[in-house]
């Protein structure tokens, strides 16, 4: 392990396709890759009228814009779909919305995704 | 280095099966998820199957649904398609290829190919 | 399922020009964007994934943008080997699809 880095081993796994993709919903995805990769965990959600929707979480391979970020922290302003990515176990249990842009309200998690 | 093999292709007649392989090398095939791709002859490239690096999820195209089965066998590094009901819209070259995880398809190794003709 | 709309189909360039290629999604994806260069006869190749991350041993001429539905192939300076059918695909929901392909031609 480099000095200073978190090293991902496994993330939050969501799928809300999880029937039409035949997976689970929930549950810890162990992350693989080359060794010479680096490995993060995501999270994908939707802000439908004030209400949080997950999309997907899960592992996400060698990003540079994952790089060193302990927090799941979307930066983007307003986007359609929100995305954010970590390094660390687990990271992507918590996420959150801070455009860089203007000051707003985060949105806080973890969430309880809806039942099918 | 990695390398992924494919074989099993060939001439088979309308409502037959095939079964393809992709032998896999060089490097740990029970860490990726692993999927199949297809192209007919002077066309673009269509998804057909995924699987996790477990076998625990697999998920399909519509277009192939009931019809094919994707599988693999860890200890044999080996990953399968078994093809029932073949039409001729199935003719296509096949192509296995590997992804880390199950949402981050990225396909970042794939085999030669393998030539699948349906026709009687 | 969501569409991949490539542009343009085909295009003629010369070795050292600036080449390109978008591909558009028919909703976001988020940065679920990934490139692909095929050859005749030949498997695709991976270019960029993640929109914009350089795979493996890819020369750095190639580069990829763009986020939401609307996304970029750049290739700096073409070279005579990077004449081939270039492929978009996203991975943000399944089926996966790919774009058409643009073919990339000597003029």
């Known amino acids: 392990a480099i000095l200073g880095r978190s090293e991902t081993q496994e993330c939050l796994f969501f799928n809300a396709n999880w029937e039409k993709d035949r997976t689970n919903q929930t549950g810890v995805e162990p992350c693989y890759g080359d060794k010479d990769k680096r490995r993060h965990c995501f999270a994908t959600w939707k802000n439908i009228s004030g209400s949080i929707e997950i999309v997907k979480q899960g592992c996400w391979l060698d990003d540079i814009n994952c790089y060193d970020r302990t927090d799941c922290v979307e930066k983007k302003d307003s986007p359609e779909v929100y995305f954010c990515c970590c390094e660390g176990n687990m990271c992507n249990e918590k996420f959150s919305y801070f455009p860089e842009m203007e000051v707003t309200q985060p949105t806080s998690n973890p969430v309880t995704p809806k039942p099918p | 280095e990695v390398q992924l093999l494919e074989s099993g292709g060939g001439l088979v007649q309308p409502g037959g099966s095939l079964r393809l392989s992709c032998a896999a090398s060089?490097?740990?095939?029970?860490?990726?998820?692993m999927n199949w791709v297809r192209q007919a002859p002077g066309k673009g490239l269509e998804w057909v199957a995924s699987i996790n690096y477990n076998s625990g999820y697999t998920s399909y195209a519509d277009s192939v649904k009931g019809r094919f089965t994707i599988s693999r066998d860890n200890s044999k590094n080996t990953l399968y398609l078994q093809m029932n009901s073949l039409r001729a819209e199935d003719t296509a070259v096949y192509y296995c290829?590997?992804?880390?995880?199950?949402?981050?398809?990225?396909?970042?190794?794939w085999g030669q190919g393998t030539l699948v003709t349906v026709s009687s | 399922d969501i569409q991949m709309t490539q542009s343009p189909s085909s295009l003629s360039a010369s070795v050292g020009d600036r080449v390109t290629i978008t591909c558009r999604a028919s909703?976001?994806?988020?940065?679920?964007l990934n490139w692909y260069q095929q050859k005749p006869g030949k498997a695709p190749k991976l270019l960029i994934y993640?929109?914009?991350s350089l795979h493996s041993g890819v020369p750095s001429r190639f580069s990829g943008s763009g986020s939401g539905t609307d996304f970029t192939l750049t290739i700096s300076s073409l070279q005579p080997e990077d004449f081939a059918t270039y492929y978009c695909q996203q991975s943000y929901d399944t089926p996966l699809t790919f774009g058409g392909g643009t073919k990339v031609e000597i003029k």
């Open positions: 909703q976001s994806i988020v940065s679920y």
């Open positions: 993640a929109a914009t």
């Open positions: 290829a590997r992804s880390a995880n199950w949402h981050d398809t990225h396909l970042d190794y």
């Open positions: 060089g490097f740990t095939f029970s860490s990726y998820s």
